[in-house]
């Protein structure tokens, strides 16, 4: 039975040209995390494999940095970066846990971080 929950940074906003950290945290399970995938809609941004370490998708290498931890840092943000981001935790023996973050990239300097929330 899958007992874990993923806590994410929730709905967040950031300024155009700036950076943002996407964070997820898996809790309430003893399952072993074998890999974490970060995805933006239909594209794989990066993976962190327990055996092989971090690997950034070639098409995002100039704007994506690994960490902190199992999180992901997006740099040089554009309005086109607005949208849904997913952290997918591949675990053994539980299976897959998915967290969702919505990022809005704003033109102005009024960007503020949203509250953290949990996805069961």
């Amino acid at each position: 039975m899958m007992t874990g929950t993923i806590e994410t940074t929730g709905n967040i906003s950031a300024e155009k040209g700036g950076s943002i950290i996407l964070q997820c945290h898996l809790s309430s399970t003893t399952a072993q995390v074998t890999q974490v995938n970060w995805e933006q809609q239909d594209q794989l941004l990066a993976i962190c494999n327990a055996d092989l370490g971090w690997h950034i998708s070639p098409s995002f290498k100039d704007r994506v940095a690994p960490g902190p931890g199992l999180g992901l840092t997006l740099q040089s943000l554009t309005v086109n970066d607005t949208g849904e981001y997913f952290c997918i935790y591949h675990t053994y023996p539980d299976g897959t846990y998915t967290g969702r973050i919505f990022l809005e990239v704003l033109e102005s300097s009024v960007a503020e971080h949203g509250a953290r929330f949990q996805i069961p």
């Epitope: 890999q35 239909d42 594209q43 794989l44 494999n49 055996d51 690997h55 998708s57 098409s59």
Partner: antibody, heavy 117, light 107 residues
Framework: QVQLQQSGAELVRPGTSVKVSCKAS????????IEWVKQRPGQGLEWIGV????????NYKEKFKGKATLTADKSSSTAYMQLSSLTSEDSAVYFC??????????WGQGTTLTVSS | DIVMTQSHKFMSTSVGDRVSITCKAS??????VAWYQHKPGQSPKLLIY???YRYTGVPDRFTGTGSGTDFTFTISSVQAEDLAVYYC?????????FGGGTKLEIK
């Protein structure tokens, strides 16, 4: 230029072991993964496993755990695959390839292994 | 393990024709798919990565599309030198499984 030079063809007896080498040149050895792929005669490509030469971390397809052991020597920029308890099912061409996780961009020329008594 | 299924083991085509090879993943793999060309007696060659990105030096007659579970590799105008076996491979999660391969035969 990037090159992966594999060791030569091997003819070995059933029950023995063999160690195939893959010498890398033309790039920073520890910055890329080394992947290993098997091709049986008339069959398709089968992924065996991968090693991160920088950390020594490895990942294997389940069926090759206990069969293949991947190692890397940073000082000589050489990756190795040892195959143990050989049977006729292990007769194949084995390729090493440089991996960026998302693709394998340079491949060795292949090493033919024949297991026969 | 993620299973990659190439429904056609063989495809027959003529020089100048457009041909498409399909690959279906048993579960979601985002755009984590690469395509390789393997000619007899040679090492495999990377053509497409991340489903749709053409690798350096690969002719633009080779294209890839798809995301999620369904992927297509297309040669817009087949040349005689394209005689080969074409493999898809998923890089979404280990083990990095290959499809069974599609052998392109020139009529």
């Amino acid at each position: 230029q990037v090159q992966l030079q594999q060791s030569g063809a091997e003819l070995v007896r059933p029950g023995t072991s063999v160690k195939v080498s893959c010498k890398a040149s033309g790039y920073a050895f520890t910055n890329y993964l080394i992947e290993w792929v098997k091709q049986r005669p008339g069959q398709g490509l089968e992924w065996i496993g991968v090693i991160n030469p920088g950390s020594g971390g490895t990942n294997y397809k389940e069926k090759f755990k206990g069969k293949a052991t991947l190692t890397a020597d940073k000082s000589s920029s050489t990756a190795y695959m040892q195959l143990s308890s050989l049977t006729s099912e292990d007769s194949a061409v084995y390729f090493c390839a440089r991996g960026e996780y998302f693709f394998f961009d340079y491949w060795g020329q292949g090493t033919t292994l024949t297991v026969s008594s | 393990d993620i299973v990659m299924t190439q429904s056609h083991k063989f495809m027959s085509t003529s020089v100048g024709d457009r041909v498409s090879i399909t690959c279906k993943a048993s579960q979601h793999v985002s755009n984590g798919v690469a395509w390789y060309q393997h000619k007899p007696g040679q090492s495999p060659k990377l053509l497409i990565y991340s489903a749709s990105y053409r690798y350096t030096g690969v002719p633009d007659r080779f294209t890839g599309t798809g995301s999620g579970t369904d992927f297509t590799f297309t040669i817009s105008s087949v040349q005689a030198e394209d005689l080969a076996v074409y493999y898809c491979q998923q890089h979404y999660n280990t083990p990095h499984t290959f499809g069974g391969g599609t052998k392109l035969e020139i009529k």
